[in-house]
């Protein structure tokens, strides 16, 4: 123990205490007395900065007295006991309860000892993220929306994306007084490359142990992007049948495939099977441009491919087939 006369009593309390709107919170406050030090506590007092009078008093002989009896309660102080714990419980936290409070011990002979505590009134926000379905506008539009509702203080929203773009964040009063709803939009120029990709909304708030991550899968509606595959420029007479495939990317999905040639309908050796075109063996050279027309809800797009079946000697028996 410290030598006599050097130990001082100390009021211990956190500098800041968080509490949730509508909940109860305890403002902890304790008197730390060195082992050899004698002290007598006659009164505990809680007051709020900027307000005259005390909000809670516990007197050694008279017990507790509260400015708002239904909302305040000394947690541990009891008549007939040593008053070393001034912790005060507050019920039904309101926004206006946020502020600086002083916990004071009247001790003898050391005198009054106090400490200030900042009460933070928090409200835990509810977070949602949703896609904003768009078409190819050619200009920046919101493609995702992230909303943090009813936070106090306002939540902090950031976005993580490999697609480029920029956020547009706004605030509005929440449903409960003193709370804030934060809305953040992720804005970019829509393209077919963006469709199906994801962006992540990160919401940070004092009430969260760790940031909340909400992933949004983007939706961009666009007409079909069409190409034809399956031809390798080496098709010969007398080879096996071959297949051309109409490759289409679109959102929504294609509703129909239509095969034709630049000359009109398909020749007899070409048979359409949905996205595929079956080319049967031919006995004379051909030079035909095939057209695949793909339709979805937003429109139709087509691709062309010119196929030549040549006379040259088939050096391999693999035939016309490129698959």
């Amino acid at each position: 123990w410290p030598p006599p006369g050097t130990g001082d009593i100390i009021v211990q309390a956190p500098t800041q205490v968080p509490g949730f709107l509508g909940d109860s919170v305890t403002l902890p406050c304790y008197l730390q007395v060195p082992g050899m030090e004698e002290t007598h506590v006659s009164q505990l007092t809680w007051s709020r900065h900027g307000e005259s009078g005390s909000m809670a008093v516990f007197h050694q002989t008279q017990g507790p007295n509260y400015s708002e009896p239904k909302r305040l309660e000394f947690v541990a102080a009891r008549l007939g006991t040593e008053l070393r714990d001034a912790s005060l419980r507050m019920f039904g936290l309101r926004v206006e309860d946020e502020g600086n409070y002083t916990c004071l011990f009247v001790t003898f002979p050391q005198g009054s000892r106090s400490v200030d505590i900042w009460l933070r009134v928090l409200a835990k926000p509810q977070n949602t993220a949703e896609v904003q379905k768009v078409q190819l506008t050619g200009k920046p539009v919101p493609v995702a929306r992230c909303v943090s509702t009813g936070g106090r203080p306002p939540a902090h929203i950031t976005w993580h994306s490999d697609l480029g773009g920029m956020p547009n964040t706004s605030q509005a009063p929440g449903f409960l007084s003193g709370t804030v709803t934060v809305t953040s939009l992720w804005i970019l120029v829509p393209s077919s490359q963006v469709d199906g990709k994801s962006v992540t909304c990160k919401v940070e708030h004092e009430s969260f142990e760790k940031p909340q991550l909400l992933t949004v899968n983007l939706t961009v509606y666009y007409p079909p992007e069409v190409s034809i595959s399956g031809y390798d420029n080496n098709w010969y007479l007398s080879q096996n049948e071959a297949t051309l495939t109409c490759d289409a990317r679109s959102n929504p999905e294609p509703t129909g495939y239509n095969w034709s040639t630049t000359m009109g309908p398909l020749p007899p050796f070409a048979v359409a099977q949905g996205a595929q075109l079956l080319i049967r063996p031919v006995d004379k050279p051909i030079n035909t441009t095939f057209i695949c027309n793909v339709t979805n809800a937003l429109g139709a797009r087509q691709a062309e491919l010119t196929v030549q079946v040549k006379e040259g000697p088939p050096s391999e028996p693999s035939g016309m087939s490129s698959n």
């Epitope: 030598p3 050899m36 004698e38 007197h59 050694q60 002989t61 002979p109 005198g111």
Partner: antibody, heavy 121, light 109 residues
Framework: QVQLVQSGAEVKKPGASVKVSCKAS????????ISWVRQAPGQGLEWIAW????????NYNQKFTGRVTMTTDTSTSTAYMELRSLRSDDTAVYYC??????????????WGQGTTVTVSS | QAVVTQEPSLTVSPGGTVTLTCRSS?????????ANWVQQKPGQAFRGLIG???NRGPGVPARFSGSLLGDKAALTLSGAQPEDEAEYYC?????????FGGGTKLTVL
Amino acid sequence: QVQLVQSGAEVKKPGASVKVSCKASGYTFTSSYISWVRQAPGQGLEWIAWIYAGTGDTNYNQKFTGRVTMTTDTSTSTAYMELRSLRSDDTAVYYCARHGLTGRHWYFAVWGQGTTVTVSS
Amino acid sequence: QAVVTQEPSLTVSPGGTVTLTCRSSTGAVTTSNIANWVQQKPGQAFRGLIGGTNNRGPGVPARFSGSLLGDKAALTLSGAQPEDEAEYYCILWYSNKFVFGGGTKLTVL
């Protein structure tokens, strides 16, 4: 105004007990701390103990533990100090003093006029 | 056992300044010793002047001030008056008891 009025002088034989009273007026007695102090002839002042009038909580100078008892009577706003097993070196003027708060600090604010206790065979 | 030492006597001229000190045998006086100063005029009751090292009691003239001076407690009287002639006692707190100094007889001459 705040006043402490002590009982009159006492002459006691060695081994006897003495009870000195200190009547308070002019303030809320139950919220006060009262110390007892003595001054032997030709000697300095010596603190004996304090009592919190509201609850009777006490703190004694270890030198006097077991021989001294402090009490209060809140109905008459009076503090008492009883000293037992008196010896000749207990001969002294005994004072009660009320501690007052100045800002956040206590001080020996108001004193009684003193009670002379003589221990003699 | 802690011993509190004061100057046995000091003299000050009227209107002058004098500092009374209070030394502790256990080491430096600190705020934890809650230095108190009381005054006793001849034939009168004791009167409290200072509590908690430097806090004047209500009604105590501003010419009295308490402080820590080096390793001692001090009572400074600035602008001494004839009526300040008295015995002054320092009181220190040692964790569980008060200890009085021997007193300083102040003469205003």
